[in-house]
């Protein structure tokens, strides 16, 4: 999906609402300096590019954080605030429902999650070229 | 492990500007935020912004915006909190203090005072 | 930005003392607080962090608890080396601010 398109303020605005807030409960207890920043992003499409696949597509060491508060809340964010999103991850969707396992909190979701940190941060700030 | 060592004790005067260095080593420069924070005596503990030392992004409180800079030099591990346009109110201990991207302060600078008076 | 109320400002205790430093915060930062102790000419010290995790080597006396908007900080029984000034500070969201210290003194 090509984010080019989406309304970035909005999606900041939900950013700083809501999903920054679960983002951080599901931190909770995490020592602020137990991750590095590997992750980085260089506009506004490229950063929600990384936060979609971050959130969504399971890598090795954390099968998924796609029922996670923050991640729904993200996908209803997407879904809202860029045009078409919502259509592309229908079959996304589809197939993730049918390998949803028992969700488990591992030292590599928790990296994963302190990564999504980064990428948000990156995806907020105010001169960061939309381009 | 971590260290920040802070430069030495500044006396200036009112409508100069102080700039204030903090070396960092025991960990990799890059990967996490540097930040400042100021006291003034008797007074509150103030955040004034941080640095990202991989991009050098920099965020700053809107109580200092115009007048704070925050730089790095990649080459020597260090970060600088710059002030201008000193007041009297600005006679404070300034620490530089690091975070990753949970943005509580667990290793922080020995503190330089800065003095301003005429 | 999100204001964060201590109290009280000064408070006189005794070795062996229980005391309980409160903070206040104006709106929800979940829990997302910490806790710093400062000795006069001294940079301040992480206590605890996420409002109730003591941090690396902070004596079992010192406990921390709370969520949302109220938050405490409690030492079980004070030792001499703790009369010092205690800070909160959430980081839940930006700007990060701190409380106004709790001066602990002897009594």
């Known amino acids: 999906y090509d984010f080019t398109n989406c309304d970035f303020e909005k999606i900041k605005a939900a950013y700083l609402s809501t999903i920054s807030k679960d983002l951080i409960t599901y931190m909770s207890g995490t020592k602020s300096t137990e991750f590095n920043n590997t992750v980085s992003c260089s506009n506004r499409p490229h950063c929600l590019t990384e936060i979609q696949s971050l959130t969504f597509n399971p890598t090795a060491g954390c099968a998924s954080l796609a029922k996670e508060m923050f991640a729904m809340k993200t996908k209803a964010a997407l879904a809202i605030w860029c045009p078409g999103y919502s259509e592309t991850q229908i079959n996304a969707t589809q197939a993730m429902k049918k390998r949803r396992k028992r969700k488990v909190t591992t030292n590599k979701c928790l990296e994963q999650v302190s990564q999504l940190q980064g990428l948000w941060r990156r995806f907020n700030r105010p001169l960061l070229k939309q381009q | 492990q971590v260290q920040l060592v802070q430069s030495g004790a500044e006396s200036k005067k009112p409508g100069a500007s102080v700039k204030v260095s903090c070396k960092a080593s025991?960990?990799?420069?890059?990967?996490?935020?540097m930040h400042w924070v100021r006291q003034a005596p008797g007074q509150c503990l103030e955040w004034m912004g941080e640095?990202?030392?991989?991009?050098?992004?920099?965020d700053y409180n809107q109580n200092f915006r115009g007048r704070v800079t925050i730089t790095v030099d990649m080459s020597a591990s260090t970060a600088y909190m710059e002030l201008s346009s000193l007041r009297s109110e600005d006679t404070a201990t300034y620490y530089c203090a690091l975070t990753g991207t949970i943005n509580y302060f667990d290793y922080w600078g020995q503190g330089t005072t800065v003095t301003v008076s005429s | 930005d999100i204001q964060m109320t201590q109290s009280p400002s000064f408070l006189s205790a005794s070795v062996g003392d229980r005391v309980t430093i409160t903070c206040k915060a104006s709106q929800d930062v979940v829990t997302a607080v910490a806790w710093y102790q400062q000795k006069p000419g001294k940079a301040p010290k992480l206590l605890i962090y996420?409002?109730?995790m003591r941090h690396t080597g902070v004596p079992s006396r010192f406990s921390g608890s709370g969520s949302g908007t109220e938050f405490t900080l409690t030492i079980s029984s004070l030792q001499p080396e703790d009369f010092a000034t205690y800070f909160c500070?959430?980081?839940?969201?930006?700007?990060?601010?701190f409380g106004c210290g709790t001066k602990l003194e002897i009594k």
């Open positions: 025991g960990y990799t420069f890059t990967s996490y935020l």
């Open positions: 640095i990202d030392p991989s991009d050098s992004y920099t």
């Open positions: 996420w409002a109730s």
């Open positions: 500070q959430q980081y839940s969201s930006f700007t990060f601010t």
